[in-house]
């Protein structure tokens, strides 16, 4: 990891607890003021590899609601709206961090958890042609 | 929010600090044992809307390294390898949670932050605006 100079104004922590347990302020700061994520909201319908969004809810997790993309087709959609059997719709997955209540039901104690979510779909060629 | 029954085994917290500040265990639990995200790692090259991955590093953030997708083309790639400018490559964006050191340089104090990242690209039909 990167060595970070200790700031004298930092909350105190015992070495045995670092970096296992830290204090986190849940007043979320949103850095996305300049970008409107709604603008990409219709891509799921207009894509050649369209997807549906499924709500995944878990009250023991923060955020409690995560939207999972499921590709609508196995193939990709041609200009005429029909399937192209030569191309495949595949999910684009990303590992994200969430907070998991631990112990369960505790309102102020969490553990970091990595989960894999499907964010959307893309259209790929199924075969990679190897040139001799 | 959902009311969660308080478990008597929970770490104590004063009302004035809840839910603003919570304890988070940084020993990450990885739920992705059954899925291998590496397998989708070549989609960026095989997609009709291929992308490059750019490393975004910030030592004041956890995770400190995030990979950002940038679409290679404005249009989409046809079967013959040429770009179809009647279609658009667009980034699929997702809001993710990260931990921001606050105060700066403090090793054990963070604030939750939402950032918008581009995960990959998809090929969409452009919106045609018809003039009356």
């Amino acid at each position: 990891g990167i060595a970070i100079p200790r700031n004298s104004g930092c909350p105190n922590s015992e070495d045995k607890n670092f970096p296992r347990t830290v204090m986190v302020n849940l007043n979320i700061h949103n850095r996305n003021t300049s970008t409107n994520p709604k603008r990409s909201s219709d891509y799921y319908n207009r894509s050649t590899s369209p997807w549906n969004l499924h709500r995944n809810e878990d009250p023991e997790r923060y955020p409690s609601v995560i939207w999972e993309a499921k590709c609508r087709h196995l193939g990709c959609v041609k200009a005429d709206g029909n399937v192209d059997y030569h191309m495949n719709s595949v999910p684009i997955q990303q590992e994200i961090l969430v907070l998991r209540r631990e112990p369960r039901h505790c309102p102020n104690s969490f553990r970091l958890e990595k989960i894999l979510v499907s964010v959307g779909c893309t259209c790929v060629t199924p075969i990679v042609h190897h040139v001799a | 929010g959902i009311a969660i029954p308080r478990n008597s085994g929970c770490p104590n917290s004063e009302d004035k600090n809840f839910p603003r500040t919570v304890m988070v265990n940084l020993n990450i639990h990885n739920r992705n044992t059954s899925t291998n995200p590496k397998r989708s790692s070549d989609y960026y090259n095989r997609s009709t809307s291929p992308w490059n991955l750019h490393r975004n590093e910030d030592p004041e953030r956890y995770p400190s390294v995030i990979w950002e997708a940038k679409c290679r083309h404005l249009g989409c790639v046809k079967a013959d390898g040429n770009v179809d400018y009647h279609m658009n490559s667009v980034p699929i964006q997702q809001e993710i949670l990260v931990l921001r050191r606050e105060p700066r340089h403090c090793p054990n104090s963070f604030r939750l932050e939402k950032i918008l990242v581009s995960v990959g690209c998809t090929c969409v039909t452009p919106i045609v605006h018809h003039v009356a």
Epitope: G75, N82, V83, Y85 | -
Partner: antibody, heavy 120, light 107 residues
Framework: EVQLVESGGGVVQPGRSLRLSCAAS????????MSWVRQAPGKGLELVAI????????FYPDSVKGRFTISRDNSKNTLYLQMNSLRAEDTAVYYC?????????????WGQGTLVTVSS | DIQMTQSPSSLSASVGDRVTITCQAS??????LAWYQQKPGKAPKLLIS???SLETGVPSRFSGSGSGTDYTFTISSLQPEDIATYYC?????????FGGGTKVEIK
């Protein structure tokens, strides 16, 4: 109950033509992808043709491309396979099969099959 | 075309035995694999799709696993009614192709 019933098989000479039909019932035919799959006597399974739910997309493997044509009449709930320029190696039981989705990728229901024998 | 190599081509096992069939694709098929059961003189029956998803009504003694190029079909406890030939099929790249089949017999 889903039912697929093939017909039109028989003995035919090399170079001749034959048309197979598959009558579907028990489901909304027009919303499912369909395929023809064949099985030579004592052999494994081979894809012959695929058609999507509305007939707008089709696929043929090289072994039958240019000789066979898959089509469907959704108003009659019927799938067809027009086979021209038949060869001895086309001898097989021909099954029509339904994809559980729109397009024709894998097959959750199959007919009982119809035997096509190409022989002089 | 993607080649699907199924093994063994035949096997003989006792009732109650665990039976395993493997299917190897010539390249990654990204879990787009189906398994079928075909009894003599009958049409094939779909058992599993997506490499692991059991079709409705299929007994839980059947299961599928694997990823990439290597997939496995398992019967946890062989029953007399499981006597059949089993086929794998990839649907990642056209033309969809089938394995050569595995004939399962009772000892």
């Amino acid at each position: 109950e889903v039912q697929l019933v093939e017909s039109g098989g028989g003995v035919v000479q090399p170079g001749r033509s034959l048309r197979l039909s598959c009558a579907a019932s028990g489901f909304t035919f027009s919303t499912y992808g369909m395929s023809w799959v064949r099985q030579a006597p004592g052999k494994g399974l081979e894809l012959v043709a695929i058609i999507n739910h509305n007939g707008g997309s089709t696929f043929y493997p090289d072994s039958v491309k240019g000789r066979f044509t898959i089509s469907r009449d959704n108003s009659k709930n019927t799938l067809y396979l027009q086979m021209n320029s038949l060869r001895a190696e086309d001898t097989a039981v021909y099954y029509c099969a339904r994809d559980p989705r729109h397009d024709g990728y894998f097959f959750d229901y199959w007919g009982q099959g119809t035997l096509v024998t190409v022989s002089s | 075309d993607i080649q699907m190599t199924q093994s063994p081509s035949s096997l003989s096992a006792s009732v109650g035995d665990r039976v395993t069939i493997t299917c190897q694709a010539s390249e990654d098929i990204y879990d787009r694999l189906a398994w079928y059961q075909q009894k003599p003189g009958k049409a094939p029956k779909l058992l599993i799709s997506g490499a692991t998803s059991l079709e409705t009504g299929v007994p839980s003694r059947f299961s599928g696993s694997g990823s990439g190029t290597d997939y496995t079909f398992t019967i946890s406890s062989l029953q007399p009614e499981d006597i059949a030939t089993y086929y794998c099929q990839q649907y990642w790249s056209v033309p969809w192709t089938f394995g050569g089949g595995t004939k399962v017999e009772i000892k």
